[in-house]
Interface confidence: low
């Protein structure tokens, strides 16, 4: 007869490991007992359990409650055992020794490999600001056994660099994602993807990018100067800009204080019925924590009577 086992048994941390040991004997042969021991190089054998054909399973004190027989039905020639709740310290060499009648004793070794799934963490880099050069957006670290794979999933253009640190029983992998910040990246997801044979599916951690910027300011409302005439109601100027964080707006008049009756409502400057007093240079000041911008416009309130008089003159001149 001969012993059948596996060269390597692979199990995920916390799962149960089946250590196979099957005696394929000739007809009439019987298995008397199967002894399991841990036999790491440089250390003496440590008994796990003894499986006796008559008296059943005996587990050594060091493995009490952790070694069991596989569930029935059981073949009397099967000396396999279950090692419950595998931990990293269980990784190593194991030997099964089978005593048979009448053929004698056989032994076989296997290696137990315990996969330690990673628990990845994502750390955002320093605050991103438009105008910076290549900047760290985020770093992602995962430690496991064997070494995990750390990659990035994103629509954002950038570069990655990885480094790994080997520990006694595991390896830590850190991947960094660098980019040149631009406002188009705002709100875009940057996802760290960690792969490992101990994971049923990839682990993903998503970081939403925030890039500080402030767009140039401009003022709307003066597109048709002819509308800015004495007596007009509802005239307003609107300051246009955008930024991250959202900017605040402030209105001033360059050539003096804001006329009475002029209302400031955030980005909008509202005028009462227009008079020539409202003519002047108005400045919209836009700012956020990142930067500030100014835009100024000249308001020239027209007197319709003057205008029509000029038109008559022009007509008569023709």
């Amino acid at each position: 007869g001969e012993l059948e086992t596996s060269d390597v048994v692979t199990v995920v941390l916390g799962q149960d490991a089946k250590l196979p040991c099957f005696y394929r004997g000739d007809s009439g042969e019987q298995v008397g007992q199967v002894a399991w021991a841990r036999v790491d190089a440089g250390e003496g054998a440590q008994e796990l359990a003894l499986l006796h054909s008559k008296y059943g399973l005996h587990v050594s004190p060091a493995y009490e409650g952790r070694v069991e027989q596989p569930p029935p039905p059981r073949n009397p020639l099967d000396g396999s055992v279950l090692l419950r709740n595998a931990v990293q310290a269980d990784e190593g060499e194991y030997e099964c020794r089978v005593s048979t009648f009448p053929a004698g004793s056989f032994q076989a070794r296997l290696r137990l490999r315990v996969l330690v799934p990673p628990l990845p963490s994502l750390n955002p880099g320093p605050a991103l600001e438009e105008g910076q050069g290549l900047t760290l957006a985020a770093s992602c670290t995962a430690e496991g056994s064997p070494a995990p794979s750390v990659t990035w999933d994103t629509e954002v253009k950038g570069t990655t660099s990885s480094r790994s640190f080997k520990h006694s029983r595991s390896a830590a992998v850190t991947s960094e994602f660098h980019l040149v910040p631009s406002r188009s990246m705002n709100g875009q997801p940057l996802t760290c993807v960690v792969s490992h044979p101990g994971l049923l599916q990839d682990q993903r951690i998503t970081h939403i990018l925030h890039v500080s910027f402030l767009a140039e300011a401009s003022v709307r409302g003066l597109e048709d100067q002819n509308l800015w005439h004495i007596g007009r109601e509802g005239a307003m100027l609107k300051c246009l800009s955008e930024g991250q964080p959202p900017p605040s707006y402030n209105w001033t008049r360059l050539d003096g204080p804001l006329p009475s009756g002029v209302r400031v409502d955030g980005d909008t400057l509202g005028f009462p019925p227009l008079t020539t007093e409202h003519s002047g240079i108005y400045v919209c000041h836009v700012s956020n924590e990142f930067s500030s911008r100014d835009s100024q416009v000249t308001v020239d309130v027209l007197d319709p009577q003057e205008d029509s008089g000029k038109q008559v003159d022009l007509v008569s001149a023709s």
Epitope: D7, T10, A147
Partner: antibody, heavy 122, light 106 residues
Framework: TVTLDESGGGLQTPGGGLSLVCKGS????????MAWVRQAPGKGLEFVAG????????GYGAAVKGRATISRDNGQSTVRLQLNDLRAEDTGTYYC???????????????WGHGTEVIVSS | ALTQPSSVSTNLGETVEITCSGS????YGWYQQKSPGSAPVTVI????KRPSDIPSRFSGSASGSTATLTITGVRAEDEAVYLC????????????FGAGTTLTVL
């Protein structure tokens, strides 16, 4: 002696699906990892899919990921490959392979089937 | 990916080595294919294990990220393509193969 018998190949239509089955004998089927490896005409070997001894872990080559499913029935000593959305580049000889341990790496294949030919053409 | 020379030639009776390098974290296997479309034959698995029906002139070893297949006393019937296989533990966790080395026996 270890034998691995593949079946299910033949002419397939693009966009369709195929199911290959491999039956193992001469070894304790439930103790070993199994894999499917293919070879396109004039090309080298390419790992398609693998499954561990217990059937609880699987791995797929990049070319078939999302289209392939590997499964095993230890009671029947069979391993099955289901490949959907067939393409012309799936044409080749598909080999069933047994590993010496419970995983499915191409580092420890110790037995191969004779192969079954798959042609994807309209 | 696994890298191996595209071709190696040797004289009858000599010793030849074929190398394979790459990121196989768990070991290497060597597979012989005598003609395209014919089933591969395992000559070495798990770095240095030889199936019982493979002649003892075939041996394997691995050091670091390089594996070596050694054929001592090459015979004419050893002329074939030899492919190395491994297990990719760095990214996708699947089996991987080299492109193959054509051994020519002069």
């Amino acid at each position: 002696t270890v034998t691995l018998d593949e079946s299910g190949g033949g002419l397939q239509t693009p966009g369709g699906g195929l199911s290959l089955v491999c039956k193992g004998s001469g070894f304790t089927f439930s103790s070993n990892g199994m894999a499917w490896v293919r070879q396109a005409p004039g090309k080298g070997l390419e790992f398609v899919a693998g499954v561990n001894a217990a059937g609880s872990w699987t791995g797929y080559g990049a070319a078939v990921k999302g289209r392939a499913t590997i499964s095993r029935d230890n009671g029947q000593s069979t391993v099955r490959l289901q490949l959907n959305d067939l393409r012309a580049e799936d044409t080749g000889t598909y080999y069933c392979a047994k590993t010496a341990d419970d995983w499915y790496g191409a580092d420890d294949i110790d037995a191969w089937g004779h192969g079954t030919e798959v042609i994807v053409s309209s | 990916a696994l890298t191996q020379p595209s071709s190696v030639s040797t004289n009858l009776g000599e010793t030849v080595e074929i190398t394979c390098s790459g990121s196989s974290g768990y070991g290497y296997g060597w597979y012989q294919q005598k003609s395209p479309g014919s089933a591969p034959v395992t000559v070495i698995y798990s770095n240095d294990k030889r199936p019982s029906d493979i002649p003892s002139r075939f041996s394997g070893s691995a050091s670091g990220s390089t594996a070596t297949l050694t054929i001592t006393g090459v015979r004419a019937e050893d002329e074939a393509v030899y492919l190395c296989g491994g297990y990719d533990s760095s990214a996708s966790y699947v089996g991987i193969f080299g492109a193959g080395t054509t051994l020519t026996v002069l």
